[in-house]
């Protein structure tokens, strides 16, 4: 399924999205625009992030050691020191008990820049993607994933951290954005809306999708997340939009069927390992890419975002389960956990395919307005 309601091969949101909520001026790049950490009151879309060390919880990664030799990912240090590593864990994003990172929330106080000054940076995420303005970069090759088909053991930690549902990934999941751009997956988490209200973080020509998955990766150039934060390319996130389809998605069901067990904020359960790549679109060759930030405090910049052109289909029931099962802080439902789109401020989104060439009949003479900046490095 490619992006929204378009012909088979048209780019993400290639044509008019049909939404009655066109991009506002604040979504356009402008010198004065400072990023919003939340939507203006009254807007239906709430803002937010998670608690990676920005994209939910980030971990500390160490290379395979003699002792249980695998990446050790502990929580990012945003607020507290990492918890004790157990053995070979990926603790990558390990939300500590007590979770002191949670003095931020979607909407309302405190303003995110007060939680982390980086949230007021100029190159923040998420953003609105306009395929017509994307720069076609033939040097952007298909993504390569290795080790994403996990055996059922060891089981993985699935946690409601109050901001999202997060699956901590074990060592050994390798991803390459291209030659010499190698990463290790740390965790994945989701963003969603509420009944009848979409909740993806990125948008396409102003169109917001029902939900969005983020798989967070650490560059192999860094041993720990805290070393990579804020460094260009230190972290990379693969993002895909989730849409409603006619059939149940069996890969997602392995996680969604366990959400009731972690309905309460701070609760967690263990789930059998699964094929993580099955949670992503099958087409690894068509995507958008730009440099942005974590979408939750600490909002560290330098994050390489790769947003798939193809969407993932879940049944209506599954999308309802996702948005209606978990509880967040203060007896409130965990819903609308997305941050408002942030201004590009001159950034150019690159596409691995000619996204500006809209195959729909309405695009008379499509012009690629931006040229590829990175020749593949």
């Amino acid at each position: 399924q490619r992006l929204p309601r378009m012909q088979e091969d048209s780019p993400l949101g290639g044509g008019s999205s049909g939404e009655d909520d066109p991009l506002g001026e604040e979504d356009l790049p402008s010198e004065e625009d400072s990023p919003r950490e939340e939507d203006p009151p009254g807007e239906e879309d709430l803002p937010g992030e998670e608690d990676l060390p920005g994209e939910e919880d980030l971990p500390e990664v160490k290379p395979k050691s003699e002792e249980e030799g695998s990446l050790k990912l502990e929580d990012l240090p945003t607020v507290e020191a990492p918890g004790d590593p157990q053995e070979p864990q990926n603790n990558a994003h390990r939300d500590k008990e007590g979770d002191d990172q949670s003095h931020w929330r979607y909407g309302g106080d405190p303003p995110w820049p007060r939680v982390s000054p980086a949230c007021a940076g100029r190159f923040q995420s998420p953003v609105d993607i306009r395929p017509q303005l994307a720069a076609f970069c033939p040097a952007l090759r298909p993504l390569e994933l290795l080790g994403f088909q996990l055996p059922p053991l060891p089981e993985l930690r699935l946690r409601n951290n109050g901001h999202s549902v997060q699956l901590t990934l074990p060592p050994g999941l390798e991803m390459a954005l291209g030659p010499g751009r190698e990463y290790r997956a740390l965790q994945l988490h989701l963003h969603w809306g509420a009944a009848g209200r979409p909740g993806s973080e990125h948008t396409v020509e102003g169109h917001r999708f029902p939900a969005e998955i983020h798989v967070v990766h650490l560059s192999t150039a860094f041993a720990r997340v805290d070393e990579a934060l804020g460094r260009p390319g230190g972290l990379a996130v693969l993002a895909a939009f989730l849409e409603e389809g006619p059939e149940e998605n069996s890969a997602y069901e392995q996680l969604l069927s366990r959400l009731e067990e972690i309905a309460e904020e701070g609760s967690e359960t263990q789930v059998p390992g699964l094929d993580i790549s099955a949670l992503l679109p099958s087409d690894f060759s068509r995507y958008f890419q730009y440099e942005g930030s974590l979408t939750t405090p600490p909002c560290a910049q330098g994050v390489i975002w790769t947003v798939f052109n193809q969407t993932v289909m879940l049944s209506a029931k599954q999308l309802h389960t996702l948005s209606d099962t978990l509880w967040g802080p203060g007896d409130s439902r965990l819903q609308l956990n997305f941050r408002a789109t942030q201004p590009l401020n001159g950034r150019v989104i690159e596409a691995s395919f000619p996204a500006g060439v809209d195959s729909s009949p309405r695009a008379a003479e499509p012009v690629q307005l931006n040229s590829c900046l990175a020749a593949g490095d």
Epitope: K64, E68, G69, S70, Q86, E87, P88, Q89, N90, N91, L146, G147, Q149, P151, P152, L153, P154, E155, P170, P171, G172, E174, Q270, P272, D275
Partner: antibody, heavy 122, light 111 residues
Amino acid sequence: QVQLVQSGGGLVQPGGSLRLSCAASGFTFSSYAMSWVRQAPGKGLEWVSAISGSGVSTYYADSVKGRFTISRDNSKNTLYLQMNSLRAEDTAVYYCAKYCSSTSCYRGMDVWGKGTLVTVSS
Amino acid sequence: QSVLTQPPSVSGAPGQRVTISCTGSSSNIGAGYDVHWYQQLPGTAPKLLIYANNNRPSGVPDRFSGSKSGTSASLAITGLQAEDEADYYCQSYDSSLRAWVFGGGTKLAVL
């Protein structure tokens, strides 16, 4: 020291049942997945079943699915294999093995019991 | 027929080097799953020899080493000794079978 002590093997008729036990000591039993592996006389090793540390998730080889049940009692540090509808081809030495920790299978099956012989014959 | 294929037997004289191959497919070794090696001396339980492709547990002599490439793995034994005479098994996970799998085993004879 880390060890696994097995019991429960013996001679049983085809169609019969048997329960194997594996008592663990020297490590935090509930933190590790456990596995059963068998070896028919003169043959190689065959994985039979595995169970997560909590006991919530269980896995079986196709050859025993529906007939064997793996379970554990973490309060007793003991792993079990309930074998029903036994067949002649189930005749083997059965080994229990400590496998994955709660976060990694990196170390393989690093501790094995001495094995217990199950003979299915009329 | 095992999913992981090993030679039924290998042999070598004391002091020599032998290798035992373990050939799999894209659904097991080639999918990136770790390969572990076990040694089974006559009449005893298997013992972990190499874990995660190329790591030795404490107590295993450095004469034993493992490697993995593509859809195959191999175990190398240098400075062969009489006490190395045993059966050797490789083990991994297979995503198609959704099962942990062993090679058929290789009998090492020290001449």
